[in-house]
Interface confidence: medium
């Protein structure tokens, strides 16, 4: 059985403050079943950015329809970027359970925020 891969193709993304940032993530397999979550930062201090299953994430939208059968694209778009959004974002696959178990993280995409040109 091929090992699941979580692919974040861009090592870094740079956007101007006020613009939107697209963070790409795909998985190599639909198995095992379980959700994808996005975090900023790693370790215990990481921030939950997007969780399709629950919560309200008003500035984040899924690029593809994550509820669509056989969807393997879990890229997100974050709107109205501010300097406080800078950091490294990780796409993380979980195995469905009670609670869900973290399986694999992408390599991360560093988001840098430029001052908006005046």
């Amino acid at each position: 059985e091929e090992e699941l891969q979580v692919i974040q193709p861009e090592k870094s993304v740079s956007v101007a403050a006020g613009d939107s940032a697209t963070l790409n993530c795909t998985v190599s397999s639909l198995i095992p079943v379980g959700p994808i979550q996005w975090f900023r930062g790693a370790g215990p201090g990481r921030e939950l950015i997007y969780n399709l299953k629950e919560g309200h994430f008003p500035r984040v939208t899924a690029v593809s329809d994550p509820t669509k059968r056989n969807n393997m694209d879990f890229s997100i778009r974050i709107s109205n970027i501010t300097p406080a959004d800078a950091g490294t974002y990780y796409c993380v696959k979980f195995r469905k359970g009670s609670p869900d178990v973290e399986l694999k993280s992408g390599a991360g995409t560093e988001l840098s925020v430029r001052a908006k040109p005046s």
Epitope: P44, E47, L48, H56, R59, A84
Partner: antibody
Framework: DVQLVESGGGVVRPGESLRLSCAAS????????MNWVRQAPGEGLEWVSR????????DYAESVKGRFTISRDNSENTLYLQMNSLRAEDTAVYYC????????????WGLGALVTVSS | ETVLTQSPATLSVSPGERATLSCRAS??????LAWHQQKPGQAPRLLIY???RRATGIPDRFSGSGSGTDFTLTISSLQTEDSAVYYC??????????FGGGTKVEIK
């Protein structure tokens, strides 16, 4: 409906400790960063501390750093503020506030808990 | 650190009249500014976020405008129940989160 209910306030002497709790309901508590904001009598609002959704990331105002500790229990939907080495200037109403998203404003506030530090 | 300065400190307005409150930031905060209302003896309540978006359940007599460093909260036709202190909050740079010093709106 979102509800935030603080408890644990009271009167203490300088140097003593107190722990505030904030019971949350009506939303997915574990998905949101939470904050404590205080208001001294007759004064404005002062942000005190923030904790991220998972509980592993914390920030503090300089005025309380090293004395106050924020924590949360996501299984119990409860936010805490452990206040040690209390000073007269910590006298205030302490509000628990939910954050709209990880980098955002405060969209819901509790009713507040009064902490009085007096000898 | 971003400092928010609110003016005037106190505003006295007759019922039905327009009230205009100002919040100025010491450096740009984009559109990342919220307004909170605090009535005497009560907790704050969110009115406006992202400079101009009304929070759920807020009457349309409240409106926000501005971006960058200069922001305005307007109450188009003041009601007696609008007597309160109004605070602006920036969330462009943090920590710390910063509030303005407040504007007290009194009914004439």
């Amino acid at each position: 409906d979102v509800q935030l209910v603080e408890s644990g306030g009271g009167v203490v002497r300088p140097g003593e400790s107190l722990r505030l709790s904030c019971a949350a309901s009506g939303f997915s508590f574990s998905s949101y960063a939470m904050n404590w904001v205080r208001q001294a009598p007759g004064e404005g609002l002062e942000w005190v501390s923030r904790i991220n959704s998972g509980g592993g990331g914390t920030d503090y105002a300089e005025s309380v750093k090293g004395r106050f500790t924020i924590s949360r229990d996501n299984s119990e939907n409860t936010l805490y503020l452990q206040m040690n080495s209390l000073r007269a200037e910590d006298t205030a109403v302490y509000y628990c506030a939910k954050q709209y998203d990880w980098n955002g404003f405060f969209d819901y506030w509790g009713l507040g808990a009064l902490v009085t530090v007096s000898s | 650190e971003t400092v928010l300065t609110q003016s005037p400190a106190t505003l006295s307005v007759s019922p039905g009249e327009r009230a205009t409150l100002s919040c100025r930031a010491s450096q740009t905060v984009g559109s990342k500014l919220a307004w909170h209302q605090q009535k005497p003896g009560q907790a704050p309540r969110l009115l406006i976020y992202d400079a101009s978006r009304r929070a759920t359940g807020i009457p349309d007599r409240f409106s926000g405008s501005g971006s960058g460093t200069d922001f305005t909260l307007t109450i188009s036709s003041l009601q007696t129940e609008d007597s309160a202190v109004y605070y602006c909050q920036q969330y462009y740079y943090w920590p710390p989160y910063r509030f303005g010093g407040g504007t007290k709106v009194e009914i004439k």
